[in-house]
C-alpha cells in the first residue's frame, strides 16, 4: 500500500476577518513546506531560518503621508512554498499583499517558470479595503492538475514603476511513471545479442524498471530508470515490455514483438505478362520477406523440351518491381520458369515452376546457296535455294519472299514475289532486257519475314543471247557477283 506523508500547512494570518488561507487544495497535499510561520514584514528574517531574507522584490514607496511618515516597504506576504499533489487533483494557492490606499489601479499578474500566464487560467483577485490599506489576495486554481502544471509560480505587481515579486510557489504534480522511451519492435538475427531501452520519469522519483519477456520477468530486482536490457539472442519471436514502478504505482509499456530474421518464403503467382519470339515478360508476387528486406531475385529458366540437355539459365535482377523480361530465348519453344528471391539471411526456395512458350518469330537466317540463271527460251529467270536450318527458322515456314530489282540505263524497279513453302525454286518473268537483275530471298513464317539473302546479280541481255551459266550467292566476304552473258 502507498502511504502518504502529510504535513498540514497553516494559513498565515493577514488581516482580521475571514480571508482565504494561503494554501487551499481540494484534497490534502502529499507534502507542503511553508517557508516560515507567521506574518513576515519585508526584510525581516524568519525566526526558523535565521539570516534568511525575504526573497521577493520589495518596493519602498517615496510618497509620505500628511504627517510625513514614510510608508512601510511593500512586499507579498509569505505563503506556502511547495505543494505536492497527485495528478488529476485540484489545487488552489494565493499571493497576498497590503497596499496603501494612495495607490490606484494595482493589478497582480501570475507567472509560471518565467512566462506570464494569460487567458484561460482560473486566477481571481479579491480586494479587501480598510482605512489606510487594501488587502489584495490573488488566487490561482487548477481543477485537475497535469504534469505540465509542474513548475514555479510567482505573483508580480507593478507600483510606481517598481515591480514587486512574490516568493515562488513550487507545484509538484506526482503520478504514475511516464515513459519517455519505450522498447521498439525490431527484426534481429537469430542468436545475436541486441539491446532494448526503457526510460520512465516521475515525479515521484525514483522510477524502477522491470523487463518482461514472453510474460516472464527478466530481472527479478528493479533497475533504476533508464534501463538497457541486453537480450542474449533469440531463436524464436518474443514479446518484450517494461514495467515502470514508483511510489504511486506501476505503468506498463507497450509490448513489442522482436522477430527473427529468416530466409524469405518463395515467390507466388509467377505469371506471364507477355511473350514474344525471343523474350518472355514475367511478374511475381513476392513471398514473406522473412523480416529482412529483399535484396534481389533470380529467375531460373530451363527448356521444357524433354530432348533438351536440361541446362538452366539464370537471370539475376533487383527485387523490385517484381517484373522481369527474360531475353535471348528461342522462338516457338517451351520453357519452365521459376523465381527465387534473397534477403540478408539467404535465398528463398524456388517458386512453383510455370510453363511458358515463346511465339513464332521471323526466321533468323536467310535461305542458303541462292543461284539464279536465265532461261532464254521461256524468257524467265530461274531461281534456286536451300531452306534455312530448322533451328533458325524460328517457326513454321509458310513460304519465301523474293525481291528482284531490275536496273538499266537509269531505271530501277523492285518487284516482290511470294512463293509457297514447299518448293526451293521459283521462276520469274524477265521484266527488262539489257538490264541487271538483282535477286534476294527471305524465308517467311507466321512470325514475319526473315533476313534477305545476299544479293545475286544476273545480266539479262537483249533478245537472242544465250545464257547457260548461273549466278549464285557468293561466299561470305566476296563482292556481289555480276554475270555478264
Amino acid at each position: 500500500a502507498i502511504t502518504e506523508a502529510r504535513e498540514e500547512a497553516k494559513p498565515y494570518p493577514l488581516f482580521p476577518g475571514p480571508f482565504p488561507g494561503s494554501l487551499q487544495t481540494d484534497h490534502t497535499p502529499l507534502l507542503s513546506l511553508p517557508h516560515a510561520s507567521g506574518y513576515q514584514p519585508a526584510l525581516m528574517f524568519s525566526p526558523t531560518q535565521p539570516g534568511r531574507p525575504h526573497t521577493g522584490n520589495v518596493a519602498i514607496p517615496q510618497v509620505t503621508s500628511v504627517e510625513s511618515k514614510p510608508l512601510p516597504p511593500l512586499a507579498f506576504k509569505h505563503t506556502v512554498g511547495h505543494i505536492i499533489l497527485s495528478e488529476h487533483k485540484g489545487v488552489k494557492f494565493n499571493c497576498s499583499i497590503s497596499v496603501p490606499n494612495i495607490y490606484q489601479d494595482t493589478t497582480i499578474s501570475w507567472w509560471k517558470d518565467g512566462k506570464e500566464l494569460l487567458g484561460a487560467h482560473h486566477a481571481i483577485t479579491q480586494f479587501y479595503p480598510d482605512d489606510e490599506v487594501t488587502a489584495i489576495i490573488a488566487s490561482f486554481s487548477i481543477t485537475s492538475v497535469q504534469r505540465s502544471d509542474n513548475g514555479s509560480y510567482i505573483c508580480k505587481m507593478k507600483i510606481n514603476n517598481e515591480e514587486i515579486v512574490s516568493d515562488p510557489i513550487y507545484i509538484e504534480v506526482q503520478g504514475l511513471p511516464h515513459f519517455t522511451k519505450q522498447p521498439e519492435s525490431m527484426n534481429v538475427t537469430r542468436n545475436t545479442a541486441f539491446n532494448l531501452t526503457c526510460q520512465a520519469v516521475g515525479p515521484p522519483e525514483p522510477v524502477n524498471i522491470f523487463w518482461v519477456q514472453n510474460s516472464s520477468r527478466v530481472n527479478e530486482q528493479p533497475e533504476k530508470s533508464p534501463s538497457v536490457l541486453t537480450v542474449p539472442g533469440l531463436t524464436e519471436m518474443a514479446v518484450f515490455s517494461c514495467e515502470a514502478h514508483n511510489d504511486k504505482g506501476l505503468t506498463v509499456s507497450k509490448g513489442v514483438q522482436i522477430n527473427i530474421k529468416a530466409i524469405p518464403s518463395p515467390p507466388t503467382e509467377v505469371s506471364i505478362r507477355n511473350s514474344t519470339a525471343h523474350s518472355i515478360l514475367i511478374s511475381w508476387v513476392p513471398g514473406f520477406d522473412g523480416y529482412s528486406p529483399f535484396r534481389n531475385c533470380s529467375i531460373q529458366v530451363k527448356e521444357a523440351d524433354p530432348l533438351s540437355n536440361g541446362s538452366v539459365m539464370i537471370f539475376n535482377t533487383s527485387a523490385l518491381p517484381h517484373l522481369y523480361q527474360i531475353k535471348q530465348l528461342q522462338a516457338l519453344a517451351n520453357y519452365s520458369i521459376g523465381v527465387s528471391c534473397m534477403n540478408e539471411i539467404g535465398w528463398s526456395a524456388v517458386s512453383p515452376w510455370i510453363l511458358a512458350s515463346t511465339t513464332e518469330g521471323a526466321p533468323s537466317v536467310a535461305p542458303l546457296n541462292v543461284t539464279v540463271f536465265l532461261n532464254e527460251s521461256s524468257d524467265n529467270v530461274d531461281i534456286r535455294w536451300m531452306k534455312p536450318p530448322t533451328k533458325q527458322q524460328d517457326g513454321e515456314l509458310v513460304g519465301y519472299r523474293i525481291s528482284h530489282v531490275w536496273q538499266s540505263a537509269g531505271i530501277s524497279k523492285e518487284l516482290l514475289e511470294e512463293v509457297g513453302q514447299n518448293g526451293s525454286r521459283a521462276r520469274i518473268s524477265v521484266q527488262v532486257h539489257n538490264a541487271t537483275c538483282t535477286v534476294r530471298i527471305a524465308a517467311v513464317t507466321r512470325g514475319g519475314v526473315g533476313p534477305f539473302s545476299d544479293p545475286v546479280k544476273i545480266f539479262i541481255p537483249a533478245h537472242g543471247w544465250v545464257d547457260y551459266a548461273p549466278s549464285s550467292t557468293p561466299a561470305p566476304g566476296n563482292a556481289d557477283p555480276v554475270l555478264i552473258i
Epitope: S216, V218, Q221, P222, L229, T230, G233, T235
Partner: antibody
Framework: QVQLVQSGSELKKPGASVKISCKAS????????MNWVRQAPGQGLEWMGW????????TYADDFKGRFVFSLDTSVSTAYLQINNLKAEDTAVYFC???????????WGQGTLVTVSS | EIVLTQSPDFQSVTPKEKVTITCRAS?????MHWYQQKPDQSPKPWIK???NLASGVPSRFSGSGSGTDFTLTINSLEAEDAATYYC?????????FGQGTKLEIK
C-alpha cells in the same frame, strides 16, 4: 571483483537449527537478488529459492517452504539461510549465487557443508 | 514445474573426441544455461542463454537449441574438461536444473 564468501561447515543434531551466511563484495548488494542452491552428497543441484535484496522479500521453491528462512542484513551486504528443525536429509552443501538477468547465476559462493547427524 | 532431463548421465571419453550433452525440457523454455562443476568446487557459469560462452570458457565449447531440446558440445575434448555439467532453464518458475552429466576422461 565480485565475491561471495560463505560461512564455514556446520555439524548439527536433528531438530536443531542452523544459520549460514553469504557475504557479498565487489558490487552493490541491493542490485542483484540472492539465490540459494542445495546439493546433497553425490547429487545434483536443487534451486531452493531467492531473496530480493532490494525489498527483502523471499521466494521459496515448493520443496523448501516451511523450515527454510532467507534473510538479509544489507548494512553488511550479507544474505542468510536458516534451516529449522534439521533432518538428516538436510545434509548437503548449500550455495548462494547472484541472481542476474534471465536467472543467470553468474557468481557463486564456495558452499557451506551442513551435516545433520545424531 | 519444468523437468530437465540430461543425457547421458555419464560418459567416458578419450581426449580430442567430440562430445555432445543434451538437455530435454518437459515443456518449451526460452533459454538454457549451463554450469560446470568439478569435485569439491562450486559450479562455474559456463554457457549463458543457450549459446553465449561465459568469460574464460574455451572456444571448443558451444551451445545450441531451442524449445525443448538443447545441447552443449565440446569439439575436441581436453583433460581439463572432465567435470559434471548441469543445464538450468529460464522461462518458467520454479527454476530447475538437469540431473547433471558427468564426463570422465579415458
Amino acid at each position: 571483483q565480485v565475491q561471495l564468501v560463505q560461512s564455514g561447515s556446520e555439524l548439527k543434531k536433528p531438530g536443531a537449527s542452523v544459520k549460514i551466511s553469504c557475504k557479498a563484495s565487489g558490487y552493490t548488494f541491493t542490485n542483484y537478488g540472492m539465490n540459494w542452491v542445495r546439493q546433497a552428497p553425490g547429487q545434483g543441484l536443487e534451486w531452493m529459492g531467492w531473496i530480493n535484496t532490494y525489498t527483502g522479500e523471499p521466494t521459496y521453491a515448493d520443496d523448501f517452504k516451511g523450515r527454510f528462512v532467507f534473510s538479509l542484513d544489507t548494512s553488511v551486504s550479507t544474505a542468510y539461510l536458516q534451516i529449522n528443525n534439521l533432518k538428516a536429509e538436510d545434509t548437503a552443501v548449500y550455495f548462494c549465487a547472484t541472481y542476474g538477468h534471465y536467472a543467470w547465476f553468474a557468481y557463486w559462493g564456495q558452499g557451506t557443508l551442513v551435516t545433520v547427524s545424531s | 514445474e519444468i523437468v530437465l532431463t540430461q543425457s547421458p548421465d555419464f560418459q567416458s571419453v578419450t581426449p580430442k573426441e567430440k562430445v555432445t550433452i543434451t538437455c530435454r525440457a518437459s515443456s518449451s523454455v526460452s533459454y538454457m544455461h549451463w554450469y560446470q562443476q568439478k569435485p569439491d568446487q562450486s559450479p562455474k557459469p559456463w554457457i549463458k542463454a543457450t549459446s553465449n560462452l561465459a568469460s574464460g570458457v574455451p572456444s571448443r565449447f558451444s551451445g545450441s537449441g531451442s524449445g525443448t531440446d538443447f545441447t552443449l558440445t565440446i569439439n575436441s575434448l581436453e583433460a581439463e574438461d572432465a567435470a559434471t555439467y548441469y543445464c538450468q532453464q529460464w522461462g518458467t518458475k520454479p527454476l530447475t536444473f538437469g540431473q547433471g552429466t558427468k564426463l570422465e576422461i579415458k
